[in-house]
């Protein structure tokens, strides 16, 4: 009888064992062992034992141990059972980006790995088994679907293999596959909303905005705006789910005419844009032009307005005869004129857009200087010792300059609260100068004195004023 | 327009002198003159005027001591019994009227009268 | 009696400095008042009329300002050629006056 141990034995992929093949007879006249495996012969004492080193076991083998007695022959097979863990567990690339509601498969690739009846391959997100089912073909696949929702957003996806050979008294091998980070994102259908200036002045600068909300994650949306080839750099502040991009932008001459103002927002693997065409125009202010600003009265004057060839323009409120962008009128310029403001308007249609500018000139008429009775009286008649306030006011433009005096040297204080006295009686020579001239207005102040009149067992004294002409006494008066 | 004194030079106290102002470019009946005097490192002092109507007006201090008189373009100081406490630099001022000034804008270079025995 | 009283009689400023002399009316005489300066050896130059209007040639750093009976004349960004003696005039007609000047400021530049 033949006999081999151990009869069962599992071990690792190039692993040795050592199987000793016994006979029951004691003078066998043949032991052996049949193997492909290479073997070395181990001596021991005795004829009825054997023991071999069988090594580089690469894949499951059944050595055969074989002997040759006096009554008859007879075999023995061991089990060698080789176990190893899988050479490749991946999962099959996916886009890092996935759109939530999204159906996503997991494919799982498990390459090796043996005994297969006791290797498992997991599906997991996180450390959550989605799903679990053993090794089968070369390849073996395993595939899950998952529905993405926006809680997945970074979560780690990722393929486990688990070879049990506990119930052989070893241990748990596993192998993970490296991890899938899911990227979720949710970027509505509805294109960003961009509000711009439909039509924009060269040389000035205007403010365009560009928003969309119900995106996930919001801080990811990458968003690019641009006018033509000239890229703009906005300021983007978030909400919860909806962004706003600001920015300004500046055009000059060379950017005249229909631009595309774009805005693309970008979120995973999609985008979104909007377009709007931007009308850029230049529209100088219209030109008003006196022949001189500053003219004296009675001088004709022409009030010009230009404007750019394709606006129209009204002077004044009177529009060009006929509608266009030149207007004039000619005045005799009076004094009721200066300081009169000459406007002229300009429209301009851009892009279906009424575009308004102004300019306003002011007309300088010189004019003067005037004394007349109404604003500068030629008689004044005031009781002695009352607050009087002498007035007398010169109209002209430059406002001239004016100065009552008495024989040439007294002044007479224009405007002031003076006390009369009898000083102040007397003829003044008022005269008003200008740039423009002068002219001259005789003013005469009558003092009333008190006469006082005493009745013979009359009740008192009566105060009698009455207009009298003072001498002049050279103890009151005096040079400046 | 200018106006120019003459007429300075030495007197003896008690005597008499005339200073002559001499003006051209304005005419005498539109126009106040006056006199300033300025004795040796002392400042200015107002004497009188004579008015375009020819009315005279003094200092209080100068009444009675002084005389101020005109023909059509020339205006005259008379200086009676002087005193060395009448050695001056004498002034003959245009009233500014015309030029819408109100002080004496026009002013003669001075003439030095001085007092001794 | 219309009298001027001057002050101070004599200050000292620095070239680039500021100088204020004042001048008191014993009674108002509105805004008839003017300002010369004078330098030893020449007659009177005015520089300012009826209190604050600037004749014309002279430099706006001579400004003048007051009426009634207060009067100031300022000179700012003193230069060494203001040098001089600066006097005021009451240019108001009235009696029993001794003097329409003030007495004189002598301003010495540094």
């Known amino acids: 009888q033949t006999s081999v141990s151990p009869s069962k034995v599992i071990l690792p992929r190039g692993g040795s064992v050592l199987v000793t093949c016994s006979t029951s007879c004691d003078q066998p006249k043949l032991l052996g062992i049949e193997t492909p495996l290479p073997k070395k012969e181990l001596l021991l004492p005795g004829n009825n034992r054997k023991v071999y080193e069988l090594s580089n076991v690469q894949e499951d083998s059944q050595p055969m141990c074989y002997s040759n007695c006096p009554d008859g022959q007879s075999t023995a097979k061991t089990f060698l059972t080789v176990y190893w863990t899988p050479e490749r567990v991946e999962l099959a690339p996916l886009p890092s980006w996935q759109p939530v509601g999204k159906n996503l498969t997991l494919r799982c690739q498990v390459e090796g790995g043996a005994p297969r009846a006791n290797l498992t391959v997991v599906l997991l997100r996180g450390e959550k088994e989605l799903k679990r089912e053993p090794a089968v073909g070369e390849p073996a696949e395993v595939t899950t679907t998952v529905l993405v929702r926006r809680d997945h957003h970074g979560a780690n996806f990722s393929c486990r293999t688990e070879l049990d050979l506990r119930p052989q008294g070893l241990e748990l091998f596993e192998n993970t596959s490296a991890p899938y980070q899911l990227q979720t994102f949710v970027l509505p259908a509805t294109p960003p909303q961009l509000v711009s200036p439909r039509v924009l002045e060269v040389d000035t600068q205007g403010t365009v905005v560009c928003s969309l909300d119900g995106l996930f994650p919001v801080s990811e949306a990458q968003v690019h705006l641009a006018l033509g080839d000239q890229r703009l750099n906005p300021t983007v502040t978030y909400g919860n789910d909806s962004f706003s991009a600001k920015a300004s932008v500046s055009v000059t001459a060379e950017d005249e005419g229909t631009q595309r103002l774009t805005c693309a927002v970008i979120l995973g693997n999609q985008s979104q844009e909007t377009l709007q065409t931007v009308t850029i125009y230049s529209f100088p202010a219209p030109n008003v032009i006196l022949t001189k600003p500053e003219v004296s009265e009675g001088t004709e004057v022409t009030v010009k307005c230009e404007a750019h060839p394709r606006a129209k323009v009204t002077l004044n409120g009177v529009p060009a005869q006929p509608l266009g962008p030149r207007a004039q009128l000619l005045l005799k310029a009076t004094p009721e004129d200066n300081g009169r403001s000459f406007s002229c308007s300009a429209t301009l249609e851009v892009a279906g857009q009424l575009i308004h500018k102004n300019q306003t000139r002011e007309l300088r008429v010189l004019y003067g200087p005037r004394l007349d009775e109404r604003d500068c009286p030629g008689n004044w008649t005031w009781p002695e010792n009352s607050q009087q306030t002498p007035m007398c006011q010169a109209w002209g433009n430059p406002l001239p300059e004016l100065k009552c005096l008495k024989d040439g040297t007294f002044p007479l204080p224009i405007g002031e609260s003076v006390t009369v006295t009898r000083d102040l009686e007397g003829t003044y020579l008022c005269r008003a100068r200008s740039t423009q001239g002068e002219v001259t207005r005789k003013v005469t102040v009558n003092v009333l004195s008190p006469r006082y009149e005493g009745g013979s067992g009359g009740s008192g004294l009566n105060d009698i004023f009455e207009a009298q002409k003072i001498e002049w006494h050279e103890e009151n008066l005096y040079f400046q | 327009q200018s106006v120019e004194e003459s007429g300075g030079g030495l007197v003896k106290p008690g005597g008499t002198l005339t200073l002559t102002c001499t003006v051209s470019g304005f005419s005498l009946s539109t126009h106040a003159m006056g006199w300033v005097r300025q004795a040796p490192g002392k400042g200015l002092e107002y004497i009188g005027i004579?008015?375009?109507?020819?009315r005279t007006y003094y200092a209080s201090w100068a009444k009675g001591r002084f005389t101020i008189s005109k023909t059509s373009t020339t205006v005259d100081l008379k200086i009676t019994s002087p005193t060395t406490e009448d050695t001056a630099t004498y002034f003959c001022v245009r009233d500014p009227y015309d030029s819408f000034d109100d002080g004496y804008r026009l002013w003669g270079p001075g003439t030095l009268v001085t007092v001794s025995s | 009696a219309y009298d001027m009283t001057q002050t101070p009689a004599s200050v000292e400023v620095a070239v680039g400095g500021t100088v204020t002399i004042k001048c008191q009316a014993s009674q108002s005489i509105y805004s008839y008042l003017s300002w010369y300066q004078q330098k030893p050896g020449q007659r009177p130059k005015f520089l300012i009329y009826?209190?604050?209007k600037v004749a014309s040639g002279v430099p706006s750093r001579f400004k003048g300002s007051g009426s009634g009976t207060e009067f100031t004349l300022t000179i700012s960004a003193v230069q060494s050629d203001d040098a001089a003696t600066y006097y005021c005039?009451?240019?108001?007609?009235?009696?029993?006056?001794?003097?329409?000047f003030g007495g004189g400021t002598e301003v010495m530049v540094k």
């Open positions: 009826d209190a604050s």
């Open positions: 005039q009451q240019a108001y007609s009235s009696s029993n006056v001794d003097n329409a």
């Open positions: 004579i008015g375009s109507s020819d």
